[in-house]
């Protein structure tokens, strides 16, 4: 387990002509803030494939006012890290999406409105542990200035954050053939070797030499599959010739979280919600203040200038907990009404409605859509009598079952070519036209259709704006 | 695994035509690529010859080449080919086939395939 | 016809040399930016180093950096080592759906 961390240092206006104009207006106030999204391996999948590594919101940055007729600055941006924890190994090698929103904060009705102002993706190769990577990726006219690594959270280290520290046996020297853990030279590495034997689909170890099964396996081995409706009691012995899943001890069992933690179990482990002025895996870290930066997701540090008096973090819309390292599950309030699916974006709370059903929170019944689904998240639009599907991105036919090409509905106009490139479609134009998707023409003095935004874009530029 | 290999002649006499195909495996051009040919003499540099889009299936040739290169799609046997008419020796070359996903760059390649133009 | 012009052709460098090689296009790329850097050793096929000329392959060391735009632009070797000796071509794409190559640079190593 551990924390990936990307720094932003900054988001402005790119080397070279045609500087951008500022996003923000004295009419139309605005602010920055930030979304990355990880996933592993070189990923080919387009923009829209699930960030399978974790993704994270930033905190809102500064209202920002431009003044009229002004090129655009570098823009204030938001306080503290964006952090995407992972609970497996670090894969090494990940492709990441990072991009940068504008949020309006006129007049609008039902609140400010969001817009995507750039993103860039890219592939990198990076080991746990290791110093920060800085980095500066270009989006038409602006420019990003960033930093990121990826750490281990205690106990495990090394470059995929796959071994374990244990505290010395002898308290002078390590065992034969292991390492003091840095930087605690008082801790040992540990090598994880489960049971023999163990299976590695269905098992797994957090002590050496043990083998516990994941959910639905049992068995000494963890290579018997459960079978529920053989089993008499709901505890008892563990029988692992009828295979019946009889809970044993469980991870919480002994409490292992220090200093006051309450212990909750997980899938595959247990997870420890520490009391104020402690933190990590089992809260056994302590004597922290603001300096040490424990609010995390941009929460603010206040008080604890000493390890002996307490700091309260204050935590972000959509985080809570004591260091605010836990996302607020706001569709646990069930929003979503007629048994829509709600998915809490960060930034937004959306429902995906069930078929015969629309509306922010599928409040609306369309008749017309009654008993017909549509596949793969896709949505049911009434349409005068027949139901048409308005299926998610990356899918497409009648009912959504067809996996789609990205440039499959020929987003790119006036004949340009769309590429499915990892970080979206990306369109070529073709002679004459210009802008996202093509869509405008160029005059022949040179001058362009181009509307005021988006900003940065010259003739013959690239899809940028998603 | 993401894959292109090349095959076709070692061997083809002046003035014949030359057919190279490439096969894929890995991805589908379901989704919409250029696939392209480009070639190198020995000791010389890489020199485009043409992609085929597979959006649309049009195709666009560097100027020498036109009228002389053929490139086409076969999709259910996940292969693309090339024609080359009236060959001579400065034909002699490795060619390469390549894949582009956007952005301008191939950033998948074959391992190339030496063709010899002797009589 | 669009030209691709690199230069050097030839250069020779000690390990640790900061190297650079330019390629000039006598039209501007598509988007300003689209244009990659690859790198041949013998008998193998070119690999992609940099794409919209300043992006790093993954993969790539960090001491590969690309820059520029339009038509001029530059490749740079911070600290020269011993597998960097290959020939290094530039690449660029063009209004059209145009491909073109540079004629190429060898770098050895002294």
């Known amino acids: 387990a551990g924390v990936f961390e990307l720094q932003i240092h900054s988001f402005g206006p790119g080397p070279g002509p045609g500087a951008p104009r500022s996003p923000c207006s004295a009419r139309l106030p605005c602010r920055l803030f930030f979304r990355v999204c990880l996933k592993p391996g070189l990923s080919e999948e387009a923009a829209e494939s699930p960030c399978a590594l974790g993704a994270a919101l930033s905190a809102r940055g500064p209202v920002y006012t431009e003044q009229p007729g002004a090129p655009a600055p570098d823009l204030p941006l938001p306080d503290g890290l964006l952090q995407v924890p992972f609970r497996d190994a670090w894969p090494g090698t990940f492709s990441f999406i990072i991009e940068t929103w504008r949020e309006e904060l006129g007049d609008q009705i039902g609140g400010p409105a969001w817009s995507l102002l750039a993103r860039v993706a890219g592939r990198r190769r990076l080991a746990a542990g290791g110093p920060w990577a800085r980095d500066i990726q270009r989006a038409g006219a602006w420019e990003l200035r960033f930093s990121y690594r990826a750490r281990c959270e205690p106990p495990a280290v090394g470059t995929a954050c796959t071994r374990l520290c244990r505290p010395r046996s002898a308290p002078s020297r390590c065992g034969p053939g292991l390492r003091p853990c840095a930087p605690l030279e008082d801790e040992c590495e540990a090598p994880l070797v489960c049971r023999a034997g163990c299976s590695p689909e269905h098992g797994f170890c957090e002590q050496p030499g043990e083998c516990r099964c994941l959910e639905g396996w049992t068995g000494p081995l963890c290579t018997v599959p459960v079978s529920t409706s053989s089993c008499l009691s709901p505890r008892g012995p563990s029988s692992a010739t009828t295979g019946c899943l009889v809970p044993g001890p469980g991870p919480c069992d002994g409490n292992p979280c220090a200093n006051g933690g309450s212990c909750s179990e997980t899938p595959r482990s247990f997870e420890c919600t520490c009391p104020r002025g402690f933190y990590g895996l089992r809260c056994e870290v302590s004597g922290v203040t603001c300096a040490d930066g424990p609010c995390f997701n941009g929460g603010l540090c206040v008080g604890g200038a000493d390890p002996d008096s307490a700091y309260i973090c204050h935590c972000p819309p959509g985080f809570q907990g004591s260091n605010c390292e836990k996302r607020v599950d706001r569709c646990s309030l069930q929003p979503c009404r007629n048994g829509g699916l709600c998915l809490d974006l960060g930034h937004a709370l959306r429902c995906r409605c069930r078929a015969g059903f629309a509306g922010p929170r599928c409040e609306h019944d369309l008749d017309d859509c009654a008993g017909r689904a549509c596949a793969n998240g896709g949505t049911c639009v009434e349409g005068g009598g027949a139901h048409r599907c308005s299926c998610a991105l990356g899918f497409g036919g009648r009912d959504c079952r067809e996996r789609a090409d990205p440039c499959a509905a020929r987003p790119c106009a006036h004949g340009g070519r769309c590429y499915a490139h990892f970080s979206g479609l990306v369109c070529a134009c073709a002679p004459g036209y210009m802008g996202a998707r093509c869509e405008f023409p160029v005059h022949p003095d040179g001058a362009s259709a181009l509307p005021a935004a988006p900003p940065g874009l010259r003739p013959g530029d690239p899809q940028r704006y998603l | 695994q993401v894959t292109l290999r090349e095959s076709g002649p070692a061997l083809v006499k002046p003035t014949q035509t030359l057919t190279l195909t490439c096969t894929f495996s890995g991805f589908s051009l379901s989704s919409s690529y250029d696939m392209g040919w480009v070639r190198q003499a020995p000791g010389q540099g890489l020199e485009w010859m043409g992609t085929?889009?597979?959006?649309?299936?049009?195709?666009d040739y560097a100027s020498w080449a036109k009228g002389r290169v053929t490139i086409s799609v076969d999709t259910s046997k996940n292969q693309f080919s090339l024609k080359l008419s009236s060959v001579t020796a400065a034909d002699t070359a490795v060619y390469y086939c390549?894949?582009?996903?956007?952005?301008?760059?191939?950033?998948?390649w074959g391992q190339g395939t030496l063709v010899t133009v002797s009589s | 016809d669009i030209q691709l012009t690199q230069s050097p052709s030839f250069l020779s460098a000690s390990v640790g040399d900061r190297v650079t090689i330019t390629c000039q296009s006598t039209?501007?790329?598509?988007?300003?930016?689209?244009l990659s850097w690859y790198q041949q050793k013998p008998g193998q096929p070119p690999k992609l180093l940099i794409y919209?000329?300043?992006n790093l392959e993954i993969g790539v060391p960090s001491r590969f950096s690309g820059s520029g735009s339009g038509t001029d632009f530059t490749l740079t070797i911070n600290s020269l080592e011993a597998e960097d000796a290959a020939t290094y071509y530039c690449?660029?794409?063009?209004?059209?759906?145009?491909?073109?190559f540079g004629g190429g640079t060898k770098v050895e190593i002294k």
């Open positions: 919209q000329a300043s």
């Open positions: 039209e501007s790329v598509y988007g300003s930016d689209w």
């Open positions: 690449q660029g794409y063009y209004s059209g759906y145009i491909y073109a």
């Open positions: 085929i889009y597979t959006g649309d299936y049009s195709t």
């Open positions: 390549a894949r582009h996903t956007g952005y301008g760059y191939f950033g998948l």
